[in-house]
């Protein structure tokens, strides 16, 4: 028997700093968790102690912070170099600065092979792109190899920017030719390493032939075998198995996301290559595992070009950017939106004629605005100041929803309404109407929203059983502010751009702002 | 196909500066990084150090830091070393070296410059 | 800096020997070395990259083996086009260092 030990992360969005226990800014550093220096502490001191180890990630090292913000993953190949990373699979975030966004700063700069089976390059990106990343690497690990196949969400065109030149395939269907091949070069364990989330995880580790073990990301999600060590509730016991169509036990793992945690597993492999053993668990990367000082000393010298960053111009408002509480919790207030205007502009996708955009909705809880700007300071807008309008480092995503939820998620926005709380929503591409004279429940008597299917965009009435694709931050996709319908009937969900880079990209894009209330919410009282 | 073309050979005084080119074609110059490596004669080869265009950054070996200065100007495509304070064991020929696949090895190399530096 | 040391410094052989090149690296630099091959009057040729991948278009001949301080390139059956100095590169860290070539020449 041969065992291998795999170390996996995944979807840690540009956490190269520790973080608070929620992956927001570390504030009681004692208290504080994940760091690429604490991660290399462990990661060392697993290297030192066992024979055959394999340190993969699966994919979302770019977007989330103003680390990639500032250095457009230069940062994710230093570190990950730093810590000789073994191999990475391609996730939809990578391609967030377009191809050539990916190519200079990761491709070319990773030490380490760079994978994705299902995304096949045409055109003239062919022959740019040749080789910079791989369907698979055989990796010698002691005196055996390994094989590494990759794949990649294949909604990434609808969740990022990888242009017209690559195409996105089925991942099972993409898959099996590799791992075959692999098979032929007399590669007998095979590891799929991936970015494509949960339900497809399971779904290669059954149905495709020849994957012995699957590593992937996308969903987030928190495996754990026993009791959890911190807030995240497990999916499931780590690893989870699957049985193949071939009747083969598959390990399936994910290692939740942003540096929290380890993953760690153990197989053990007969001499034909089947897995007879697998066992482990994520470990939680907490302030008992000391940071590597040369590892948090180069951490400090990057950090210089960040703290300089946040006070630069990003572009100018020649009107007061109403973030107020007592605005934005109670009607229509011009941050709103401005932010919901940026969120619909950062995911402007054009993959199908009969289609303006794929998405042309925003919902934002007006509770997560906290803070106004003020356009008498020469109307200048920085980092810092979008840094105190959005200050707990959320993402804005994706979701589909029916029109039915849409509808109980506006009823909720106004159950309580006078109370200054949270849950009141701001919105882009909807116009709502309350009646606060009806009951809690039956108080919205008007929702249109922007059509998508059309060449002129315009409002109709929501229709109940239809299925739409919104904008909105991750805590309200969480069931936050009390938003339980959206986390209990949501149909997807995909994790989007952090939301101070998306709000500061639209801003220095515009160059000069002057967002208006407008209209977009309205109250009445009486018939309609 | 991708090349790369260096300006020529130059004999320069001590203590003055040169300053080479290299020009990048038939490809995406900001695909790319450059390396600068020099040989003097008969001796191996010395990594000077690099620029990534695309994201205007350059690593220096500690050696050179005092005297190199790498460059590069995207509208020509173009990738510059200029070293100063010349003296005479700085006689060599300098090459530009860029890797198609990785920018740590590389399958792509000017033909090279000789300067000589003499009085 | 990273020293690699390189040996032998110069090495005699005739046509279809098997020739053994080796090189040293003062710590551990994983599998991150690169192997060059350079004739006179030449810009050097990239054969072996991550210290075991041929370079497309490089004779089969070639390989290279080796992890961690301890790297070797070998050539199977020395061939006439193969008289030519070899320099190992580590790119572990900063600087890029080469090692110091290693002379082949016919006996």
């Known amino acids: 028997a041969w065992e291998l030990t795999i170390l996996h992360t995944n979807d840690v969005h540009s956490r190269l700093e520790q973080t608070s226990e929620d992956s927001s800014k570390c504030v009681n550093a004692s208290r504080c968790m994940g760091g690429v220096a604490r991660l290399f502490t462990k990661v060392q001191q697993i290297r030192r102690a066992e024979p055959n180890v394999l340190l993969l990630d699966a994919g979302d090292q770019y977007q989330g912070t103003i680390w990639f913000t500032v250095y457009k993953g230069a940062e994710v190949a230093h570190f990950m170099n730093a810590l000789r990373y073994d191999a990475m699979a391609l996730g939809n975030h990578e391609f967030d600065n377009g191809v050539e966004g990916l190519i200079e700063p990761l491709l070319k700069e990773a030490k380490f092979p760079i994978l994705s089976a299902n995304i096949k390059a045409k055109g003239p990106l062919a022959s740019q792109i040749s080789g910079l990343y791989l369907p698979y690497k055989v990796l010698p690990v002691g005196d055996e190899v390994v094989g590494i196949v990759g794949y990649t969400s294949k909604e990434t065109p609808f969740l990022s920017n990888p242009g017209t030149n690559l195409v996105f395939e089925d991942e099972i269907t993409a898959l099996q030719p590799e791992v075959d091949k692999l098979k032929t070069l007399n590669v007998n364990k095979i590891i799929a390493l991936g970015h494509s989330g949960f339900e497809m995880d399971k779904l290669i580790a059954q149905k495709v032939r020849g994957v012995d073990v699957v590593v992937g990301g996308h969903s987030n999600t928190f495996l754990y075998t026993g009791n959890p060590p911190s807030k995240e509730v497990p999916a499931g016991k780590y690893p989870f198995i699957v049985t193949s169509d071939d009747g083969r036990k598959v390990p399936v793992v994910q290692a939740y996301a942003f540096g929290k945690y380890l993953g760690y597993l153990k197989i053990e492999f007969d001499e034909r290559g089947n897995v007879i053993s697998s066992h482990g668990n994520p470990i939680l990367l907490n302030s008992s595992i000391p940071e590597d000082p040369s590892i948090k000393a180069d951490i400090n010298k990057w950090r210089i070009k960040l703290d300089n960053y946040s006070t630069q111009e990003l572009g100018k408002t020649i009107v007061y950017l109403d973030g107020s509480s007592q605005s934005c919790r109670f009607r229509e207030c011009n941050m709103g939106n401005l932010i919901c205007d940026a969120m619909i502009n950062n995911n402007l996708r054009h993959t199908d004629e009969m289609f303006w955009n794929h998405v042309s909705m925003c919902i934002l809880n007006g509770g997560g605005i906290r803070s106004p700007i003020d356009e008498r300071n020469n109307g200048t807008i920085t980092w810092e100041n979008l840094a105190a309008v959005l200050p707990f480092g959320g993402t804005f995503d994706l979701v589909q929803l029916k029109g039915s939820t849409l509808k109980k998620a506006f009823e909720h926005s106004v159950h309580r309404y006078g109370q200054s709380t949270g849950e009141f929503l701001q919105v882009g591409g909807i116009h709502v109407v309350y009646d606060l004279s009806r009951k809690p429940g039956d108080r919205v008597v008007k929702l249109d929203v922007l059509c998508t299917k059309c060449r002129v965009p315009s409002y109709d009435p929501l229709k109940m059983d239809e299925v739409y694709k919104v904008i909105l931050p991750n805590f309200l996709a969480n069931g936050g502010d009390g938003f339980q319908m959206i986390k209990d009937e949501l149909l997807r969900h995909d994790s989007g751009d952090q939301d101070i880079n998306v709000v500061s990209t639209y801003i220095s894009k515009m160059k000069v702002i002057y967002p208006a209330v407008e209209g977009r919410i309205k109250f009445s009282t009486g018939s309609h | 196909q991708v090349q790369l073309v260096q300006s020529g050979a130059e004999v320069k005084k001590p203590g003055s500066s040169v300053k080479v080119s290299c020009k990048f074609s038939g490809g995406s110059f900001t695909s790319y990084s450059f390396s600068w490596v020099r040989q003097a004669p008969g001796q191996g080869l010395e990594w000077m150090g690099r620029i990534i265009p695309v994201l205007t950054t350059t690593d220096y070996a500690q050696k050179f830091r005092d005297r190199v200065t790498i460059t590069a100007d995207e509208s020509t495509s173009t990738a510059y070393m200029e070293l100063s304070g010349l003296r005479s064991e700085d006689t060599a020929v300098y090459y530009c070296?860029?890797?198609?696949?990785?920018?740590?090895?590389?399958?792509?190399w000017g033909r090279g410059a000789l300067i000589t530096v003499s009085s | 800096d990273i020293q690699m040391t390189q040996s032998p410094s110069f090495l005699s052989a005739s046509v279809g020997d098997r020739v053994t090149i080796t090189c040293q690296a003062s710590q551990d630099i994983s599998h991150y070395l690169n192997w060059y091959q350079q004739k006179p009057g030449k810009a050097p040729k990239l054969l072996i990259y991550?210290?075991?991948s041929l370079e497309t278009g490089v004779p089969s001949r070639f390989s290279g083996s080796g992890s961690g301080t301890s790297f070797t390139l070998t050539i199977s059956s020395l061939q006439p086009e193969d008289f030519a100095t070899y320099y190992c590169q580590q790119y572990d860290d900063f600087p890029l260092t080469f090692g110091g070539g290693t002379k082949v020449d016919i006996k």
């Open positions: 070296a860029s890797g198609l696949k990785k920018n740590w090895y590389f399958d792509l």
């Open positions: 991550d210290a075991s």
